[in-house]
């Protein structure tokens, strides 16, 4: 199967599935990290 072209920046090209989605709130401890738009 051919790979596909991406519309996101190249920094993600060699990532893995455990890359955090920083566009959503993340609650790993008692503190919640909210990344602004």
């Amino acid at each position: 199967m051919d790979s596909f072209n991406y519309t996101t920046p190249d920094y993600g090209h060699y990532d893995d599935k455990d890359t955090l989605d920083l566009n959503t709130p993340v609650d790993k401890t008692s503190n919640t990290l909210r990344v602004p738009d």
Epitope: G12, D15, T19, D27
Partner: antibody, heavy 119, light 110 residues
Framework: EVQLVESGGGLVKPGGSLRLSCAAS????????MHWVRQAPGKGLEWVGR??????????DYAAHVKGRFTISRDDSKNTLYLQMNSLKTEDTAVYYC??????????WGQGTLVTVSS | QSVLTQPPSVSGAPGQRVTISCSGS????????VSWYQQLPGTAPKVLIY???QRPSGVPDRFSGSKSGTSASLAITGLQAEDEADYYC??????????FGGGTKLTVLG
């Protein structure tokens, strides 16, 4: 052409062992995290485990149901991913796929190889 | 039982719009990206949506993805006969494992 080709599947008795291979071509294999995913006949997709690239640390993680029995390794000089399966159970019967990760998704999949565990 | 919850089946007539939901928790969908895959009978899965809402080149814009909190959804508009397939959502989990939905069988009526 970017391609993954699995091999090594077949019929094995419960308690037996099998080693699957996944040959990569058309891309810089060493730079990518690689995963194994399986699918029992008529069932859904089930994650087996992964190995990160050397640049990412080369670490492995496994699903609970295969931990201690399955081992994932890679030979970047041969552009090949491996899945060593020991102490096989009937419930391990499935089509096994290798998959490449890019942009947080499985963007390239192999065609799959069938493993049948039966006495 | 799958960590991510999808409806077992959905159906729609040609030209209609259908959505497939995928429910998770703060340890997976709430923290990590969601992907959607299409699997036609006897073939390997193919990615339709990556990073929640991004579409690979070659995938028709009839397919769209969204994510809100701990849930995600796949929408298919202008349903076509060739869309009949199994669809899976997918994410990572804090417990260092990948998680899939149980899959949804899409039937195109008529």
């Amino acid at each position: 052409e970017v391609q993954l080709v699995e091999s090594g599947g077949g019929l094995v008795k419960p308690g037996g062992s099998l080693r699957l291979s996944c040959a990569a071509s058309g891309f810089t294999f060493s730079s990518y995290a690689m995963h194994w995913v399986r699918q029992a006949p008529g069932k859904g997709l089930e994650w087996v485990g992964r190995i990160k690239s050397k640049a990412q640390g080369g670490t492995t993680d496994y699903a609970a149901h295969v931990k201690g029995r399955f081992t994932i390794s890679r030979d970047d000089s041969k552009n090949t991913l491996y899945l060593q399966m020991n102490s096989l159970k009937t419930e391990d019967t499935a089509v096994y796929y290798c998959a490449r990760v890019s942009f947080s998704t499985f963007d390239v999949w192999g065609q799959g190889t069938l493993v049948t565990v039966s006495s | 039982q799958s960590v991510l919850t999808q409806p077992p089946s959905v159906s729609g007539a040609p030209g209609q719009r259908v959505t497939i939901s995928c429910s998770g928790s703060s340890s997976n969908i709430g923290s990590y990206y969601v992907s959607w895959y299409q699997q036609l009978p006897g073939t390997a899965p193919k990615v339709l949506i990556y990073r929640n809402n991004q579409r690979p080149s070659g995938v028709p814009d009839r397919f769209s993805g969204s994510k809100s909190g701990t849930s995600a959804s796949l929408a298919i508009t202008g349903l076509q006969a060739e869309d009949e397939a199994d669809y899976y959502c997918d994410s990572w989990d804090h417990s260092s494992m990948n998680v899939f939905g149980g899959g949804t069988k899409l039937t195109v009526l008529g």
